[in-house]
Interface confidence: low
C-alpha cells in the first residue's frame, strides 16, 4: 500500500512563463501522515536535488505545504515534495517538471510568393524565441471561402505552403496564427491578388547570333515562360565578356515590354560574350525570375583600331655609308587588334623618294639604310582592314638629339614600378620607356613599351623581377625623329644585398689602418646601397662600429692600439637591411715607422751590461688573413 | 593591419618638457619617413618635424627649432619627440604620420590617432 | 617654402550635391597634391594622391584635378558621412609638409 503515493503536488504539470512568480503545493495523505508519524511540519521541498531554504515555504495547514519561486528563470525545473521521517530519513512523496518560456509573439513581416508552377508558399518572422512547442498556422480566405488551415511543419515553423492551386485575379486574404501553452496571437492580415505574387520562371532557349555587316551587335533571341499568357513581362538582360567577372545591364527602359529578341549594341568587334536574362512582371509587382542558362556569342571582326606601338635600333657597328636598322612593333592587345592579324605592312621612304615596301609576319624587320633620313610607317591588317598608321622618323645620321624630359623619376608603387617625368617644352608625338635588367654576368636585353605623348606618369608593363636593378631609359620622340634619351635606375622591390663587401687593409701603422674594398657587383646588391657599417675589434675588446658612406671605398681607422691583432668586417644595407661581408684580421705594428732607428740600440745600462738588437721580427709582427 | 599609437601627452606648464612617442606595426618602419603634425584646438594641421628612414636627417619647423628633438629606433620600430622650454602655443593634437620613402609623391598614408599636449600654467 | 591656399574656407551643402573644393600653390608643384579628409576627433585620412589618383578603399564620388598650381577636389554627390575637414597638401618639395589651411564642409 506504500506504493501508492504519500501526497500530490498541484498544480501537476504545469507550464509557466520565465520571469514569472509560481507556487505549488504538497498535500499529504492522512494514511501516510498516520503511518509515519508527520504532517506539513516535516515536508523538505527540493528542486533538482537541492534542498529549498525554508522561507519559500507556507505550511498551509496540518496535511498541505506550499513553496514560492520568484523570477523563474530556468527552462526546465524538477520539483519533488519530501517528508522526514523516523531519524530525519527523507522519503520522496512526489515530483513534477516545471516547464518555462515565453508566450509567441505577433508573427511579422507576412509575405507571399507564387513561383511559376507551384502553389503559393508563405512565410514570416515568428519574434522571439519561446522556449516551448509553439504551432503556427497559415490561415487564407476569399470574400466568400475559407481554405484549408496551412500547418506549418515543425522543421520549418516560418514558411507554408499552402494546398490549393493558385487563382489569379481574385484578392485573397491571409494570416497566421502562433499558439502554445501561454497564449495565442494573430499576424496582421494581409489581403493580395495572386498575380502580384508571381515569380516566373527564367526564359530558356537562350541563343546568339552575330552580323557580318557590324562588328559590335549581337542578336538574343529566346522562349518567354508559360506565365507569358497569364501576365506581360520585362526583362533584364546582362552580359560579359567570357574572361570578364564583373555584368554589364541593358538599360531597363530598353527591354521593358514582352518580347522574345533583343539587338545588344556597342559591343567590342571579335570579342566573346556571355549573355543572361531573367524576367517579371511588366509593371513591377511581384519578383525577378532566377537567370536563365547563359549563353556565348563572338562578334564579327573589325579592322585594328589602332597602329601598333612602332620603334627602331640602330646596329652601332655600320659599314661605311650604310646602317643596319632593326624596326620594330608590338603585337596589338585584343581589343584593339578586333580580329586575328594576318601580316604587318612596313614602308620605307628615303627623304623624297620612295623607298620599300614590306609585308611581314613577325613583330621586327632588319633593313640597311643610307645615312639619310627616312620616314618608317607600320599598319597591322586583319580580314576587314588595316589600321592607322604608325609613323617613325629615322633621322640621317648626322641628327644630333636633343629635348630630353626632365626630372625623371622611377619609384614602386602596388607591386609596379612606376616611371614619371616632366615633359619637354616642344611638342612630341610619343614616349619610348626601355628597361633592362643590370648585370655583371649578362647583358642588358631591353624590353620597352610605348606612351602617348601626353602621357608624363606610367607603369612598366612587363614581368619585373624583385631585387633587380632595371635601367629605365626614356626617350621622347618628336616629329623629326627621337630626342635624347634620359635613364635612371630603380627597383620594383629592395632586399638586403645577398652578399657583404669584404675589407682588406691598404696600409697599416701603429694606430691607424687604411682599409679598402670594392663595390658590390650589382648582382648581389639587390638595392641602392645607401651606406656601410664596419664594426671592428680586439680579440678581448668591444666592438666598434663606423657607418661610412655608400661612395666611399676605403676609410681610415685612427686611434689603434700597437702591436694588437685586430678583426674587422664590413656590412652593406640597402633600404630592405644589411648583410655582413667576411672577417678580416690584421695587426698593428709595435713601432711607427720613424721610432725604429731611436729604438734598435739600447744602452748597456738598460741591459745589465749587454748591448742587443731588436729584431725586425719584433717590429713587423704583422699578419693578414 | 598597419598601425601607429602615439603616447606621452598630457598637461605641463609652460617651460616643462615632455617626450611623445609611436610605436610602430604592420609595417616596415625602416623603410618609412616619418612626421609628427600637430594640429591646435579649432586649428588646422601644422607640420613639426621630420626624420628620414635611416635617422640621418632631421628637420623641424622654426616654431619649434631648438626646442624639439625628433628622433628614431628603428630596432623597436618606435618613433619620438623630445619636447623642451614648452610653450602655451605648442598645445595642440600632435599626430606621428609618415609614407613609404618610395612612395613620398603619393602623400602620408599613414597616421596615428594622436596624443593631446597642454601646456598651461 | 611652398604656400597652400585653399577655398573656400568653408562651405554648406545638401545631400546630393556636386561640391568643388579649390586649393592653390605659390610655385608650381607639378601634379604633387594630395587631399585629406579629417572628421572630428579623428587623424586626417588620404583621399586622393599625385592631383587624381584615388588612395585604395575611397569612394569613386571623390575625384581630384589640376597640375602646376591650381588643384580641384570635387565630390559628386555628396553623401552625409562626407561632411568633415578637407585639406591639401603638396608632396613636390618636403620637407617640410606644407598643408592648405582647410576647408570645412557643413550640412546646410
Known amino acids: 500500500e506504500l506504493l501508492d503515493p504519500c501526497g500530490y503536488i498541484s498544480p501537476e504539470s504545469p507550464v509557466v512563463q520565465l520571469h514569472s512568480n509560481f507556487t505549488a503545493v504538497c498535500v499529504l495523505k492522512e494514511k501516510c501522515m498516520d503511518y509515519f508519524h508527520v504532517n506539513a511540519n516535516y515536508i523538505v521541498w527540493k528542486t533538482n536535488h537541492f534542498t529549498i531554504p525554508k522561507e519559500q515555504y507556507t505550511i498551509i495547514n496540518r496535511t498541505a505545504s506550499s513553496v514560492t519561486f520568484t523570477d523563474i528563470s530556468s527552462l526546465n525545473i524538477q520539483l519533488t515534495c519530501n517528508i522526514l521521517t523516523f531519524g530525519q530519513l527523507e522519503q520522496n512523496v512526489y515530483g513534477i517538471t516545471i516547464i518555462s518560456g515565453l508566450p509567441p509573439e505577433k508573427p511579422k513581416n507576412l509575405s507571399c510568393i507564387v513561383n511559376e508552377g507551384k502553389k503559393m508558399r508563405c512565410e514570416w518572422n515568428r519574434g522571439r524565441e519561446t522556449h516551448l512547442e509553439t504551432n503556427f498556422t497559415l490561415k487564407s480566405e476569399w470574400a466568400t471561402h475559407k481554405f484549408a488551415d496551412c500547418k506549418a511543419k515543425r522543421d520549418t515553423p516560418t514558411s507554408c505552403t499552402v494546398d490549393y492551386s493558385t487563382v489569379y485575379f481574385v484578392n485573397i486574404e491571409v494570416w497566421v496564427e502562433a499558439e502554445n501553452a501561454l497564449g495565442k496571437v494573430t499576424s496582421d492580415h494581409i489581403n493580395f491578388d495572386p498575380v502580384y505574387k508571381v515569380k516566373p520562371n527564367p526564359p530558356h532557349n537562350l541563343s546568339v547570333i552575330n552580323s557580318e555587316e557590324l562588328s559590335s551587335i549581337l542578336k538574343l533571341t529566346w522562349t518567354n515562360p508559360s506565365i507569358k499568357s497569364v501576365i506581360r513581362l520585362k526583362y533584364n538582360i546582362q552580359y560579359r565578356t567570357k574572361d570578364a567577372s564583373t555584368w554589364s545591364q541593358i538599360p531597363p527602359e530598353d527591354t521593358a515590354s514582352t518580347r522574345s529578341s533583343f539587338t545588344v549594341q556597342d559591343l567590342k568587334p571579335f570579342t566573346e560574350y556571355v549573355f543572361r536574362i531573367c524576367c517579371m512582371k511588366e509593371d513591377g509587382k511581384g519578383y525577378w525570375s532566377d537567370w536563365s542558362e547563359e549563353a556565348n556569342g563572338i562578334t564579327y571582326e573589325d579592322r585594328p583600331s589602332k597602329a601598333p606601338s612602332f620603334w627602331y635600333k640602330i646596329d652601332p657597328s655600320h659599314a661605311q655609308g650604310y646602317r643596319t636598322v632593326q624596326l620594330m612593333w608590338k603585337t596589338l592587345p585584343p581589343f584593339e587588334a578586333n580580329g586575328k592579324i594576318l601580316d604587318y605592312e612596313v614602308t620605307l621612304t628615303r627623304w623624297k623618294s620612295h623607298l620599300q615596301n614590306y609585308t611581314v609576319n613577325d613583330t621586327k624587320l632588319t633593313v640597311n639604310l643610307t645615312n639619310d633620313r627616312y620616314v618608317a610607317t607600320l599598319t597591322a591588317r586583319n580580314l576587314v582592314g588595316k589600321s592607322d598608321a604608325a609613323v617613325l622618323t629615322i633621322p640621317a645620321c648626322d641628327f644630333q638629339a636633343t629635348h630630353p624630359v626632365m626630372d625623371l623619376k622611377a619609384f614602386p608603387k602596388d607591386n609596379m614600378l612606376w616611371v614619371e617625368w616632366t615633359t619637354p617644352r616642344e611638342s612630341v608625338k610619343k614616349y619610348i620607356l626601355e628597361w633592362c635588367v643590370l648585370s655583371d654576368k649578362a647583358p642588358c636585353i631591353a624590353d620597352w613599351q610605348q606612351e602617348d605623348g601626353t602621357v608624363h606618369r606610367t607603369h612598366l608593363r612587363g614581368n619585373l623581377a624583385e631585387s633587380k636593378c632595371y635601367l629605365i631609359t626614356v626617350t621622347p620622340v618628336y616629329a623629326d625623329g627621337p630626342g635624347s634619351p634620359e635613364s635612371i635606375k630603380a627597383y620594383l622591390k629592395q632586399a638586403p644585398p645577398s652578399k657583404g663587401p669584404t675589407v682588406r687593409t691598404k696600409k697599416v701603422g701603429k694606430n691607424e689602418a687604411v682599409l679598402e674594398w670594392d663595390q658590390l657587383p650589382v648582382d648581389v646588391q639587390n638595392g641602392f646601397i645607401r651606406n656601410y657599417t664596419i664594426f671592428y675589434r680586439t680579440i678581448i675588446g668591444n666592438e666598434t662600429a663606423v657607418n661610412v658612406d655608400s661612395s666611399h671605398t676605403e676609410y681610415t681607422l685612427s686611434s689603434l692600439t700597437s702591436d694588437t691583432l685586430y678583426m674587422v668586417r664590413m656590412a652593406a644595407y640597402t633600404d630592405e637591411g644589411g648583410k655582413d661581408g667576411p672577417e678580416f684580421t690584421f695587426t698593428t705594428p709595435k713601432f711607427a715607422q720613424g721610432e725604429i732607428e731611436e729604438q734598435k740600440l739600447i744602452s748597456e745600462e738598460d741591459l745589465g751590461g749587454e748591448q742587443k738588437l731588436i729584431s725586425e721580427e719584433d717590429l713587423h709582427h704583422h699578419h693578414h688573413h | 593591419e598597419v598601425q601607429l599609437v602615439e603616447s606621452g601627452g598630457g598637461l605641463v606648464q609652460p617651460g616643462g618638457s615632455l617626450r611623445l612617442s609611436c610605436a610602430a606595426s604592420g609595417l616596415t618602419f625602416s623603410s618609412y619617413e616619418m612626421n609628427w603634425v600637430r594640429q591646435a584646438p579649432g586649428k588646422g594641421l601644422e607640420w613639426v618635424s621630420h626624420i628620414s628612414s635611416a635617422g640621418s636627417t632631421k628637420y623641424y619647423a622654426d616654431s619649434v627649432k631648438g626646442r624639439f628633438t625628433i628622433s628614431r629606433d628603428n630596432a623597436k620600430n618606435s618613433l619620438f619627440l623630445q619636447m623642451n622650454s614648452l610653450r602655451a602655443e605648442d598645445t595642440a593634437i600632435y599626430y606621428c604620420a609618415g609614407y613609404n620613402y618610395a612612395y613620398y609623391y603619393f602623400g602620408v598614408d599613414v597616421w596615428g590617432q594622436g596624443t593631446t599636449v597642454t601646456v598651461s600654467s | 617654402d611652398i604656400q597652400m591656399t585653399q577655398s573656400p574656407s568653408s562651405l554648406s551643402a545638401s545631400v546630393g550635391d556636386r561640391v568643388t573644393i579649390t586649393c592653390r600653390a605659390s610655385?608650381?608643384?607639378?601634379?604633387?597634391l594630395n587631399w585629406y579628409q579629417q572628421k572630428p576627433g579623428k587623424a586626417p585620412k588620404l583621399l586622393i594622391y599625385a592631383a587624381s589618383s584615388l588612395q585604395s578603399g575611397v569612394p569613386s564620388r571623390f575625384s581630384g584635378s589640376g597640375s602646376g598650381t591650381d588643384f580641384t577636389l570635387t565630390i559628386s554627390s555628396l553623401q552625409p558621412e562626407d561632411f568633415a575637414t578637407y585639406y591639401c597638401q603638396q608632396s613636390y618639395s618636403t620637407p617640410p609638409i606644407t598643408f592648405g589651411q582647410g576647408t570645412r564642409l557643413e550640412i546646410k
Open positions: 610655385q608650381s608643384i607639378s601634379s604633387y
